[in-house]
């Protein structure tokens, strides 16, 4: 019954979660954990905020939105297949067992672009080795590594493919939103 989100290997994954603070700056603690939301707290915590700031985070996990306005969506950098699974966003509303809990399913697909290592040529002088794709937050990148012998038109097509696949996974219009207060 979890809402499903998708990303490709090497991309940044975006898991949306929002709440509306009762008043500006009146923040609620939030935790993100790997695995379905347990009864209390978060299991396998990857990121946590308190009433003021992000007070715990682990490598590759960050909040790209304005968490002071209730955007506590999680970005996972440079995902691998091992990042697949359920993630818990827990809005820790004051009270007894009063938390809002959202289970989000992340599905990681193999990258579309996995060129076979044929004749090696260094295109660094002519083209950047990193093609920027559109996404949430800082420029997200797909490392191409050593490319086969391809022409400029193919490079352009490749860039468009990468951009389009990222746009297809743009999840701005979905995600959990709750109002507090």
């Amino acid at each position: 019954s979890e809402v499903e989100y998708r990303a490709e290997v090497g991309q940044n994954a975006y898991l949306p979660c929002f709440y509306t603070p009762a008043a500006p700056g009146n923040l609620v603690p939030v935790c993100w954990g790997k695995g379905a939301c347990p009864v209390f707290e978060c299991g396998n915590v990857v990121l946590r905020t308190d009433e003021r700031d992000v007070n715990y985070w682990t490598s590759r996990y960050w909040l790209n939105g304005d968490f002071r306005k209730g955007d506590v969506s999680l970005t996972i950098e440079n995902v691998t297949l091992a990042d697949s699974g359920i993630y818990c966003c827990r809005i820790q509303i004051p009270g007894i067992m009063n938390d809002e809990k959202f289970n989000l399913k992340l599905v990681i697909k193999p990258a579309k672009v996995t060129p076979a290592p044929t004749r090696q040529r260094d295109f660094t002088a002519a083209f950047p080795r990193m093609l920027t794709t559109r996404g949430h937050g800082p420029a997200e990148t797909q490392t191409l590594g050593s490319l086969p012998d391809i022409n400029l038109t193919q490079i352009s097509t490749l860039a468009n493919e990468l951009r389009d696949s990222r746009l297809a996974n743009d999840l701005r219009d979905s995600g959990a939103t709750i109002r507090i207060g």
Partner: antibody, heavy 113, light 107 residues
Framework: QVQLQESGPGLVKPSETLSLTCKAS????????INWVRQPPGKGLEWIGW????????KYNPSLKSRATLSTDKSKNQASLNLSSVTAADTAVYFC??????WGKGTTVTVSS | DIQMTQSPSSLSASVGDRVTITCKAS??????LGWFQQKPGKAPKTLIY???RLVDGVPSRFSGSGSGQDYTFTISSLQPEDIATYYC?????????FGPGTKVDIK
């Protein structure tokens, strides 16, 4: 605003199954815990069980000896309690609550033949 | 299961008096303790959570304290509208368990 409303038959015969529903509104039903609590006449509060509508996880009070079953209907924003093989000792006011901060008004159930 | 004992079971006090109720858990409950007020024919109302945190909108004359197994609930100046039964609850682990309640009335 958060509202919960319990409903069900006011009278149940001994050995039958008691079925109650809890209609929730004013919040995202699938994201919050639901607890069921009962109160026999003139007595204290007794926790019956917990369910998380998001994934259907449940916990029960062992004192009820597996007679209680909690479920939810997400399409109706509704939680349900079934209590089997009832006796006069199950006569009580039954409450549902979001977490344990927002409570319904309660519904009175009498077990009698 | 965690047992909760509450004392006294009932008390009478005058308006303006300081009222104290205690609750003891059979094991450490890590401050996962709440206090509820229940008036006749009504649902319980949460006053205190996490042992000492006041729910928004609850008058400041109500307070809670304690840790480990021992907890206290205080009404600093009893008001007529405080006539009710008060329950403690541990929510450190399942099954959740309530204290037997303390009935408070006016002398």
């Amino acid at each position: 605003q958060v509202q919960l409303q319990e409903s069900g038959p006011g009278l149940v015969k001994p050995s039958e199954t008691l079925s109650l529903t809890c209609k929730a509104s004013g919040y995202t039903f699938t994201s919050s815990d639901i607890n069921w609590v009962r109160q026999p006449p003139g007595k204290g509060l007794e926790w019956i069980g917990w369910i998380f509508p998001g994934d259907g996880s449940t916990k029960y009070n062992p004192s009820l000896k597996s007679r209680a079953t909690l479920s939810t209907d997400k399409s109706k924003n509704q939680a349900s309690l079934n209590l089997s093989s009832v006796t006069a000792a199950d006569t009580a006011v039954y409450f549902c609550a979001r977490g344990l901060d927002y409570w319904g008004k309660g519904t009175t159930v009498t077990v009698s033949s | 299961d965690i047992q909760m004992t509450q004392s006294p079971s009932s008390l009478s006090a005058s308006v303006g008096d300081r009222v104290t109720i205690t609750c003891k858990a059979s094991q450490d409950i890590n401050s996962y303790l709440g206090w509820f007020q229940q008036k006749p024919g009504k649902a319980p109302k949460t006053l205190i959570y996490r042992a000492d945190r006041l729910v928004d909108g609850v008058p400041s004359r109500f307070s809670g304290s304690g840790s480990g197994q021992d907890y206290t609930f205080t009404i600093s100046s009893l008001q007529p509208e405080d006539i009710a039964t008060y329950y403690c609850l541990q929510y450190d682990e399942f099954p959740l368990t309530f204290g037997p309640g303390t009935k408070v009335d006016i002398k």
